[in-house]
């Protein structure tokens, strides 16, 4: 694609190339043959994050505590506010407009990946040899107890929800 009539950081208006406003500033008036583009800084709680010809700055995102949100990074004149969720909650979307409680892994399932402010808990079924007997957002599948290492024998087989039950070995009379 060949270059356009105006260079980078310029825009074409009424047969002339005007300078775009830098990030953090909005357009007040286009340039003319005799005057430069006029730009003004964005106000408090406003931003523009690109070279632009916008006549209005965007409002910073509001991290609504009623939706479980809190400020992760305060916005500047060039960046939007970044919201995240309160402890124990995570965002429902990439834009993080609301939060939901972290999911717990049911008995028989363990935590594969602990939830973050932006992603939910990932559970996995406990494979043979492992179990989880609680509903938890943190607990992994635990390995069955090894009876042999305790000089005991398996009295009751383990499941994905229960540990094995060990007991003493039958003594030869």
């Amino acid at each position: 694609e060949p270059p356009t009539a105006c260079r980078e950081k310029q825009y074409l208006i009424n047969s002339q190339c005007c300078s775009l406003c830098q990030p953090g500033q909005k357009l007040v008036s286009d340039c003319t043959e005799f005057t430069e583009t006029e730009c003004l800084p964005c106000g408090e709680s406003e931003f523009l994050d690109t070279w632009n010809r916008e006549t209005h700055c965007h409002q910073h995102k509001y991290c609504d505590p009623n939706l479980g949100l809190r400020v992760q990074q305060k916005g500047t004149s060039e960046t939007d506010t970044i919201c995240t969720c309160e402890e124990g909650w995570h965002c429902t979307s990439e834009a993080c407009e609301s939060c939901v409680l972290h999911r717990s892994c049911s008995p028989g399932f363990g935590v594969k990946q602990i939830a973050t402010g932006v992603s939910d808990t990932i559970c996995e079924p406990c494979p043979v040899g492992f179990f989880s007997n609680v509903s938890s957002a943190f607990e992994k599948c635990h390995p069955w107890t090894s009876c042999e290492t305790k000089d005991l024998v398996v009295q009751q087989a383990g499941t994905n929800k229960t540990d094995v039950v060990c007991g003493p070995q039958d003594r030869l009379r």
């Epitope: 060949p2 270059p3 356009t4 009539a5 105006c6 260079r7 074409l12 208006i13 009424n14 047969s15 002339q16 190339c17 286009d30 003319t32 043959e33």
Partner: antibody, heavy 116, light 107 residues
Framework: EVQLVQSGAEVKKPGESVKISCKAS????????IEWVRQMPGKGLEWIGV????????NYNEKFKGQATLSADKSISTAYLQLSSLKASDTAVYFC?????????WGQGTLVTVSS | EIVMTQSPATLSVSPGERATLSCRAS??????LNWYQQKPGQAVRLLIS???RLHSGIPARFSGSGSGTEYTLTISSLQSEDFAVYFC?????????FGQGTKVEIK
Amino acid sequence: EVQLVQSGAEVKKPGESVKISCKASGYGFTNYLIEWVRQMPGKGLEWIGVINPGYGGVNYNEKFKGQATLSADKSISTAYLQLSSLKASDTAVYFCARGGSGFAFWGQGTLVTVSS
Amino acid sequence: EIVMTQSPATLSVSPGERATLSCRASQDISNHLNWYQQKPGQAVRLLISSTSRLHSGIPARFSGSGSGTEYTLTISSLQSEDFAVYFCQQGNTLPWTFGQGTKVEIK
């Protein structure tokens, strides 16, 4: 005094090409855009495209993309409009104009007649 | 593309009278509206740029006004040399587009 002087009238056959020139004087050639406009007989004005003579950047009207090619030679302060695959319906007066808050100064126009 | 509509197509006025020409855009053009005069055998002439800015060398009897989609060219007292065709043109959004023209003729 700003002046745009265009090349003379052309008569072409269908399928041929034509290259019109527009020589600028009286101002800094690379400081302003050059616009090109078509006026068919008895009709209004139609924008073809614009070129920045400083570095050759162009914008075309979609309608003329592929048929019109704009260029400029800084060393002789001259802009060019080339039209290819001419048809009878391309018969028109073609104008160049200097930009800067509208089409500030115009050439006298070049009549291109396409006839078999 | 933005469609520019001029009215009337022809305006019959006596010398010394006021002439009012209208130009409507199909969408807001933010005052990027220019007026041109065309006479047979002469180069097209820019009269007014950006709605109301008189181009150098243009007599003060020409004035422009308007905003949004509605624009007006006024010639306060027509002189013999003002009988011509007048075009409006928007410079807000590519492709640049022109009105179909208003012919101002002697009444």
